[in-house]
C-alpha cells in the first residue's frame, strides 16, 4: 500500500481466482483514543472500532472511502484504490492502445519545435467517475522540471457503437534551450482513477523523436506563362523553432485529386518555392519536416488548383 | 590549437556539402548498425547516452546563433560564446567565436575518428565478421576536417593489448553511432546557420 | 498486371516521320501519366515528353519541342509518339512508360527501334 | 537542364561482393533522384524512388541514399542476375534527365 495524494491510498493486488489479498492497517488521523468507529462509503454498518482497522482487500468490494467517527461526528476519512497485476502485468483496462507507432501505446506526444513544451494525448471510452493526474521530469535518477498542467477532454469521437474520449495534456520542461543536444529522456507519468481502480501509464521520449511541425502558412500559387506549370510558394509555420537557418525544414510539394488513388505530381524541397503541374479539379499540398533530423512530417496546408 | 587559415572558397559555403554528407553518412551507417544488430540493444530507446566529447568540448555552446544567447537556458554555467558572421574558413574576418566553434566542431570530429577507427579494428578481429565501420563514413568525417583546415595534434590510435570482448565492442559502436548522429545534426544545423549568414 | 505494348521496329528516312504506339492493358488508362524517352544504341536513357490521357495536357522536353507530338486514345487505351523531320541521330529505341506520380516510372513498354537511314 | 553525372560508368565486382554507384547532380535536387536497372535487350525497371525508398518486388539487397547533390545506389551482395546498367533519373524540374548509365561487370 502507498499513499497516491492525501488520505488516498493504492492497494496492489495481485488478482487472480482465490487470491489471499493484502491485509491493511487503517489508522484514524485523530488524537482520541476512545469510542471510534468505521464505515465504509456510504453504508451505515460498523465495520469495527478503535483508532486503527485492519482489513483483508481481495476485491473491489473492499476498496472505497473507509470513515472513522465519533459520536456521529467525522474524524477523519481514506480512500483505498486498487491496482490490479494480473499475470505479473499491471492493469490496462482504462486507457485505449492506440496501437501507432507500436503496440502497448497508450500514451502519444508531440511537439511543434524544439522550446521544450509539448503536448501529450491518451484515449479511453470511459465517460464518467474519471480523473487523471500528470507528472513529468528529464531524467529518472536526478530529475529535472517539466511542468505539466491539468488533463482536459479534448475531444469526443463515435467508433462504431462506441464513443471515444481523447484527453490531452500541455507540459513545459523549464529550462529548455532549442539547441540543446539531449542525453537524458524526457518521462511522462499519468494516473488514472475510474471509480475505485487506479493505473499508471509512462512514455519516455526525446524531445527530437517527437517533433512533429505545424503546416507550413501562406501557400500562394502563380501559374508560369505558356505552361501548365505553377510556382508554389509558402512559409514556415509561426510555431517553428527560429533562427530558421539553423532549425531548417524540408518540405515535401504534392499536386493531387480528392481520391488518394489518382494520379499526382510530387516533389521534395529545401527551398519555400517549387514548380509543379496543376491539374483540373486537383488541389496542391505542402508539409514540412525537420531537414536534419527525420521525425513526423507536419499535416498537409493545402490551396485548390483553380 | 590554431586559429584557422583563410583559404578563400568561391561558390557555395564549402563546408556545408561536407556536413550534409556527414549526416548522410552516419544515418546510414546507424542504420546498418541498427538491422545487422538486430538482436544487441541498438536502438535510441535501448542504449545509454554517452557523449564521448563530454566536458572536452562545447560544441552546442560554442556554436550558438546569435538569436538564442538571450536564451537563459541556453546560457546556464557556461561563457557566452556565440556565432557572428562568416563562412567555413572562407573569410579573412573570421572572428574569433566562429573559429572557436569550427575549432570545437573540428576536435568532436578528431575524437570520433579515433573511436570509430579504434572500434574497426576490434571488429575486424570479430570471426563472426558481423559489422565493419562503412569506410565512406570515415571518408567523410575526414574530408570535412580537410574542409575545417585546422592544425591539431594527431592523437595517437588507442591499441589494447586485452582480447576484445566483441558484443561490448559493438554495444559502444551502437551508443557511438547514435551519439554521432545527434552532433553530426548540429553541426549541419550550424554549417547551414553560417552559409545563410 | 500492368502491361505497355509497343508497336514494331521502324525503318525511316530522313526527314520523315515515325509514329509509335504503346497500347496499355490493366489499370484505367486515364489514371496514369504517360511518357516517352529513349535510348541511342550503347547510350543512356533521354526524356522526351509526357501526356495526361484524361485531359491531353502535354508538356515536351526542350530538346524535342516542336518535332515530338504526343497523343492518347482513351478508348483504345492507346498513346502515341509522332517524331517528324527525322535525322540519323534520332536512331534508337523508344520506349513508353507509365506512372500515377508524373516524375518517374514504375512500368516500361518493351520498347521500339525507330532505325532513320538513307 | 539540370545534368546528372554517374561514376564510375562501369565496375568490375565479384559476385557475392556489395557494390556502390554514385550519381551526382550539377544543382541540389533536395531527394526528387530514382534508381532504375537495365539489362541488354530489356527495358528499364525501377528500383528506387525519391533517393531511398524501397520499391515492392524489388529485392532488400538494393539501397538508396543521399540528398541534394550527392546520391548513392549501393547492392549489399551481388547475384548474378544483377549485373547490368544502373540509371539514376532527377525529377526536380523538367525536362527530367538521366545519368549516363554505370555498368556493373562480373570481376
Known amino acids: 500500500i502507498w499513499e497516491l495524494k492525501k488520505d488516498v491510498y493504492v492497494v496492489e493486488l495481485d488478482w487472480y481466482p482465490d487470491a489471499p489479498g493484502e491485509m491493511v492497517v487503517l489508522t484514524c488521523d485523530t488524537p482520541e483514543e476512545d469510542g471510534i468507529t468505521w464505515t465504509l462509503d456510504q453504508s451505515s454498518e460498523v465495520l469495527g472500532s478503535g483508532k486503527t482497522l485492519t482489513i483483508q482487500v481481495k476485491e473491489f468490494g473492499d476498496a472505497g472511502q473507509y470513515t472513522c467517527h465519533k459520536g456521529g461526528e467525522v474524524l477523519s476519512h481514506s480512500l483505498l484504490l486498487l491496482h490490479k497485476k494480473e499475470d505479473g502485468i499491471w492493469s490496462t483496462d482504462i486507457l485505449k492502445d492506440q496501437k501507432e507507432p507500436k503496440n502497448k501505446t497508450f500514451l502519444r506526444c508531440e511537439a511543434k519545435n524544439y522550446s521544450g513544451r509539448f503536448t501529450c494525448w491518451w484515449l479511453t471510452t470511459i465517460s464518467t467517475d474519471l480523473t487523471f493526474s500528470v507528472k513529468s521530469s528529464r531524467g529518472s535518477s536526478d530529475p529535472q522540471g517539466v511542468t505539466c498542467g491539468a488533463a482536459t477532454l479534448s475531444a469526443e469521437r463515435v467508433r462504431g457503437d462506441n464513443k471515444e474520449y481523447e484527453y490531452s495534456v500541455e507540459c513545459q520542461e523549464d529550462s529548455a534551450c532549442p539547441a540543446a543536444e539531449e542525453s537524458l529522456p524526457i518521462e511522462v507519468m499519468v494516473d488514472a482513477v475510474h471509480k475505485l481502480k487506479y493505473e499508471n501509464y509512462t512514455s519516455s521520449f526525446f524531445i527530437r523523436d517527437i517533433i512533429k511541425p505545424d503546416p507550413p502558412k501562406n501557400l500562394q500559387l502563380k501559374p508560369l506563362k505558356n505552361s501548365r506549370q505553377v510556382e508554389v510558394s509558402w512559409e514556415y509555420p509561426d510555431t517553428w523553432s527560429t533562427p530558421h537557418s539553423y532549425f531548417s525544414l524540408t518540405f515535401c510539394v504534392q499536386v493531387q485529386g480528392k481520391s488518394k488513388r489518382e494520379k499526382k505530381d510530387r516533389v521534395f524541397t529545401d527551398k519555400t518555392s517549387a514548380t509543379v503541374i496543376c491539374r483540373k479539379n486537383a488541389s496542391i499540398s505542402v508539409r514540412a519536416q525537420d531537414r536534419y533530423y527525420s521525425s513526423s512530417w507536419s499535416e498537409w496546408a493545402s490551396v485548390p488548383c483553380s | 590549437r590554431n586559429l584557422p587559415v583563410a583559404t578563400p572558397d568561391p561558390g557555395m559555403f564549402p563546408c556545408l556539402h561536407h556536413s550534409q554528407n556527414l549526416l548522410r553518412a552516419v544515418s546510414n551507417m546507424l542504420q546498418k548498425a541498427r538491422q545487422t544488430l538486430e538482436f544487441y540493444p541498438c536502438t535510441s530507446e535501448e542504449i545509454d547516452h554517452e557523449d564521448i566529447t563530454k566536458d572536452k568540448t562545447s560544441t552546442v555552446e560554442a556554436c550558438l546563433p546569435l538569436e538564442l544567447t538571450k536564451n537563459e537556458s541556453c546560457l546556464n554555467s557556461r561563457e557566452t560564446s556565440f556565432i557572428t558572421n562568416g563562412s567555413c574558413l572562407a573569410s579573412r574576418k573570421t572572428s574569433f567565436m566562429m573559429a572557436l566553434c569550427l575549432s570545437s566542431i573540428y576536435e568532436d570530429l578528431k575524437m570520433y575518428q579515433v573511436e570509430f577507427k579504434t572500434m574497426n579494428a576490434k571488429l575486424l578481429m570479430d570471426p563472426k565478421r558481423q559489422i565493419f565501420l562503412d569506410q565512406n563514413m570515415l571518408a567523410v568525417i575526414d574530408e570535412l576536417m580537410q574542409a575545417l583546415n585546422f592544425n591539431s595534434e594527431t592523437v595517437p590510435q588507442k591499441s589494447s593489448l586485452e582480447e576484445p570482448d566483441f558484443y561490448k565492442t559493438k554495444i559502444k559502436l551502437c551508443i557511438l553511432l547514435h551519439a554521432f548522429r545527434i552532433r553530426a545534426v548540429t553541426i549541419d544545423r550550424v554549417m547551414s546557420y553560417l552559409n545563410a549568414s | 498486371q500492368v502491361q505497355l505494348v509497343q508497336s514494331g521496329a521502324e525503318v525511316k528516312k530522313p526527314g520523315s516521320s515515325v509514329k509509335v504506339s504503346c497500347k496499355a492493358s490493366?489499370?484505367?488508362?486515364?489514371?496514369?501519366?504517360l511518357h516517352w524517352s529513349r535510348q541511342a544504341p550503347g547510350q543512356g536513357l533521354e526524356w522526351m515528353g509526357w501526356?495526361?490521357?484524361?485531359?491531353?495536357?502535354?508538356e515536351y522536353a526542350p530538346k524535342f519541342q516542336g518535332r515530338v507530338t504526343i497523343t492518347a486514345d482513351e478508348s483504345t487505351s492507346t498513346a502515341y509518339m509522332e517524331l517528324s523531320s527525322l535525322r540519323s541521330e534520332d536512331t534508337a529505341v523508344y520506349y513508353c512508360?507509365?506512372?500515377?506520380?508524373?516524375?518517374?516510372?514504375?512500368?516500361w513498354g518493351q520498347g521500339t527501334l525507330v532505325t532513320v537511314s538513307s | 537542364d539540370i545534368v546528372m553525372t554517374q561514376s564510375p560508368l562501369s565496375l568490375p565486382v565479384t559476385p557475392g561482393e556489395p557494390a556502390s554507384i554514385s550519381c551526382r547532380a550539377s544543382?541540389?535536387?533536395?531527394?526528387?533522384l530514382h534508381w532504375y536497372q537495365q539489362k541488354p535487350g530489356q527495358q528499364p525497371r525501377l528500383l528506387i524512388a525519391f533517393a531511398s525508398q524501397s520499391i515492392s518486388g524489388v529485392p532488400s539487397r538494393f539501397s538508396g541514399s543521399g540528398s541534394g547533390t550527392d546520391f548513392t545506389l549501393t547492392i549489399s551482395s551481388l547475384q548474378p542476375e544483377d549485373f547490368a546498367t544502373y540509371y539514376c533519373?532527377?525529377?526536380?524540374?523538367?525536362?527530367?534527365?538521366f545519368g549516363q548509365g554505370t555498368k556493373v561487370e562480373i570481376k
Open positions: 512508360a507509365r506512372n500515377k506520380e508524373l516524375r518517374y516510372f514504375d512500368v
Open positions: 544543382q541540389s535536387i533536395s531527394i526528387n
Open positions: 490493366g489499370g484505367t488508362f486515364s489514371d496514369y501519366y
Open positions: 533519373q532527377q525529377s526536380n524540374s523538367f525536362p527530367l534527365t
Open positions: 501526356i495526361d490521357p484524361e485531359n491531353g495536357d502535354t
